[in-house]
């Protein structure tokens, strides 16, 4: 008797509940510094209930605000290491369509080895976000320290 | 005429908006690297609506996808305490039941004394999230500073 | 065939789905600790859908569990900037009405130049959200480095 | 079985050039982080340099930084090493390591290693 | 950077021995510590990692302990094949950093 059967009528894709967890795949190759990530039970505790992927990169499957949160930790990493190699910045942003590319939130390490952030943006469908991590660190892949998620809010 | 009122014939519990926000309440014994949380009205801004405290730990009651958020401040911190005392290290996870054991959430201080972070992952009706600080500093117990919630997401 | 469709009957507003998302326009001045804050879709990917701004500051217009967040990002900031100008703290609280003030989040920048978080609260119709940063150190205008929003959970 | 097949190695002067290869096999090579780690006759071992799993971040040793360049070639299963301005110290048997793939970063598999001279 | 102290350098013993090295972190690097052994003219091979994991395919008289600043590789009934140099290795930050080895050798 929980809501969604409650409206038994609607699929839970038509209540807008999209949401992806996400965990790091891998880098990106010369010149490229975005982040890959995979997600899908079989990989663990990552998911993908709406929004798809596109090569490694989170794609948008429903107009919304969204919360997108990202917590990326440095492998190899003390707050000597992290300050000796700064600027280590990361930013997560729409990298498409191109007529909508911005940057929707960015964080430095300084001399932390974790950032940790989220925040509410309004996407639409078919906006690609691309998590760029420049610097020379290599983020861990351990899912419990590095991963990236949206969570549809509203219309 | 909110969406609980217009939907009369349901609980607000049926709705599976099940939601906890917990204060600290005391670090463990040695040897105990567990927070032990406490929450409730009583208590000034601390909750639960459906999870339930278990000896200090919060267990879920209901199916679903979670956003699950922490943050913990070191009390008598400074940069130099922190970096001369790391590696203090914070880890959420699920403790019990032991089959579905697995670490969700971590993070370090390194020169820090807060650390803050959030992340969406499914969890079961049963499972008991322990959150552990390992390292010798001690965690403020001040509400705006330490706090460990929960919410439901979708199923 | 979204959930608001579904409920055609029910306007948006109705289901308690207020949430905004704020980007810094400017320091208080002298003596004043708060920042204040501006939103809508004319300035960017800020909007206000239920709350309101008075003077800067964000007023809740609907009971309920709410998810605040923010990110603040200071200007011109090195760790060792942030270690120098120590302490520079940043506090989330309910400024008004007087009788339920209170401090909801608080963080410091210790050797970081960014904090980040999010916590679980009850606010009430007609609290005022306020913001204070005290030290020397100015934020960043940036509106992917510096923000704050809220989110209607549940009742 | 995975195997790592270290090549390049050799005679050079000092000031000289000289490219290490590092063949891999048995394991899906895009996948994992790989290292250079070094061992001058009769020392211990130095790590030299590491490279993500797609190439686009590397990190260097102070003692090299600015002289030595890691590259990998994904599509070949190959990892480099352009060692440039060689100096006397940089004598030694050239490892290449793969790293585990939690991002622990102990290395799990080593080549034989080639053997790199500086001399006039 | 981190040094890492290995003791004893050097150490003579018989098959059938318990064997100790141990290495010491010149600051905290928590279970980041990694053990290998190395035959002569031939690469390392892990041993243990993160301070007390047995690496696959390892005998398990090969044991690891220690975190924090200080580690030890226990060798609990040595056999020929095991005489070597063995090195301890941190993978707790960059630069990564080894020990300078300890050589076991028949007594």
């Known amino acids: 008797q929980r809501f969604a059967q409650a409206q038994q009528q609607l699929p839970l894709e038509s209540l807008g509940w999209d949401v992806a967890e996400l965990q790091l795949n891998h880098t990106g190759p010369q010149q490229d510094p975005r982040l890959y990530w995979q997600g899908g039970p079989a990989l663990g505790r990552s998911f993908l209930h709406g929004p798809e992927l596109d090569k490694g990169q989170l794609r948008i499957h429903r107009d919304g605000i969204y919360m997108v949160h990202i917590q990326v930790t440095l492998a190899i990493c003390s707050s000597t290491t992290a300050s000796r190699h700064h600027p280590t910045t990361l930013a997560v942003g729409i990298c498409s369509p191109a007529s909508r590319s911005i940057s929707l939130l960015r964080l430095s390490f300084h001399q932390g080895c974790t950032i940790a952030s989220q925040r509410l943006t309004p996407l639409a469908r078919g906006d690609t976000l691309c998590t760029n991590l420049t610097g020379t660190l290599l983020p861990s892949r351990n899912t419990d320290e590095t991963f990236f998620g949206v969570q549809w809010v509203r219309p | 005429q909110r969406f609980a009122q217009a939907q009369q014939q349901l609980p607000l519990e049926s709705l599976g908006w099940d939601v906890a926000e917990l204060q600290l309440n005391h670090t463990g014994p040695q040897q105990d690297p567990r927070l032990y949380w406490q929450g409730g009205p009583a208590l000034g801004r601390s909750f639960l609506h459906g999870p339930e405290l278990d000896k200090g730990q919060l267990r879920i009651h209901r199916d679903g996808i979670y956003m699950v958020h922490i943050q913990v401040t070191l009390a008598i911190c400074s940069s130099t305490t922190a970096s001369r005392h790391h590696p203090t290290t914070l880890a959420v996870g699920i403790c019990s039941p032991a089959s579905r054991s697995i670490s969700l959430l971590r993070l370090s201080f390194h020169q820090g004394c807060t650390i803050a972070s959030q992340r969406l992952t499914p969890l079961a009706r049963g499972d008991t999230l322990c959150t552990n600080l390992t390292g010798t500093l001690l965690p403020s117990r001040n509400t705006d500073e330490t706090f460990f919630g929960v919410q439901w997401v979708r199923p | 065939q979204r959930f608001a469709q579904a409920q055609q009957q029910l306007p948006l507003e109705s289901l308690g789905w207020d949430v905004a998302e704020l980007q810094l326009n400017h320091t208080g001045p002298q003596q004043d600790p708060r920042l204040y804050w501006q939103g809508g879709p004319a300035l960017g990917r800020s909007f206000l859908h239920g709350p309101e701004l008075d003077k800067g500051q964000l007023r809740i217009h609907r009971d309920g569990i709410y998810m605040v967040h923010i990110q603040v990002t200071l200007a011109i900031c090195s760790s060792t900037t942030a270690s120098r100008h120590h302490p520079t703290t940043l506090a989330v609280g309910i400024c008004s009405p007087a009788s339920r003030s209170i401090s909801l989040l608080r963080l410091s920048f210790h050797q970081g130049c960014t904090i980040a978080s999010q916590r679980l609260t009850p606010l009430a119709r007609g609290d005022t959200l306020c913001t204070n940063l005290t030290g020397t150190l100015l934020p960043s205008r940036n509106t992917d480095e510096t923000f704050f929003g809220v989110q209607w959970v549940r009742p | 079985e995975v195997q790592l097949l270290e090549s390049g190695g050799g005679l050079v002067q000092p000031g000289g050039s000289l490219r290490l290869s590092c063949a891999a096999s048995g394991f899906t090579f895009s996948s994992y982080a790989m290292s250079w780690v070094r061992q001058a006759p009769g020392k211990g071992l130095e790590w030299v340099s590491v490279i993500s799993d797609s190439g686009g971040i590397t990190d260097y040793a102070d003692s090299v930084k600015g002289r030595f360049t890691i590259s990998r070639d994904n599509s070949k299963n190959t990892l480099y090493l352009q060692m440039n301005s060689l100096r006397a110290e940089d004598r030694a048997v050239y490892y290449c390591?793969?790293?585990?793939?939690?991002?622990?970063?102990?290395?799990?598999?080593w080549g034989q290693g080639t053997l790199v001279t500086v001399s006039s | 950077d981190i040094q890492m102290t290995q003791s004893p350098s050097s150490l003579s013993a018989s098959v059938g021995d318990r064997v100790t090295i141990t290495c010491r972190a010149s600051?905290?690097?928590?279970?980041?510590l990694n053990w290998y052994q190395q035959k002569p003219g031939k690469a390392p091979k892990l041993l243990i990692y993160?301070?007390?994991s047995l690496q696959s395919g390892v005998p398990s008289r090969f044991s690891g302990s220690g975190s924090g600043t200080d580690f030890t590789l226990t060798i609990s009934s040595l056999q020929p094949e095991d005489f070597a140099t063995y090195y301890c290795q941190q993978s707790y930050s960059t630069p990564l950093t080894f020990g300078g080895g300890t050589k076991v050798e028949i007594k």
């Open positions: 993160a301070a007390s």
């Open positions: 390591a793969r790293h585990d793939y939690s991002n622990r970063y102990y290395f799990d598999y």
């Open positions: 600051q905290s690097i928590s279970s980041y």
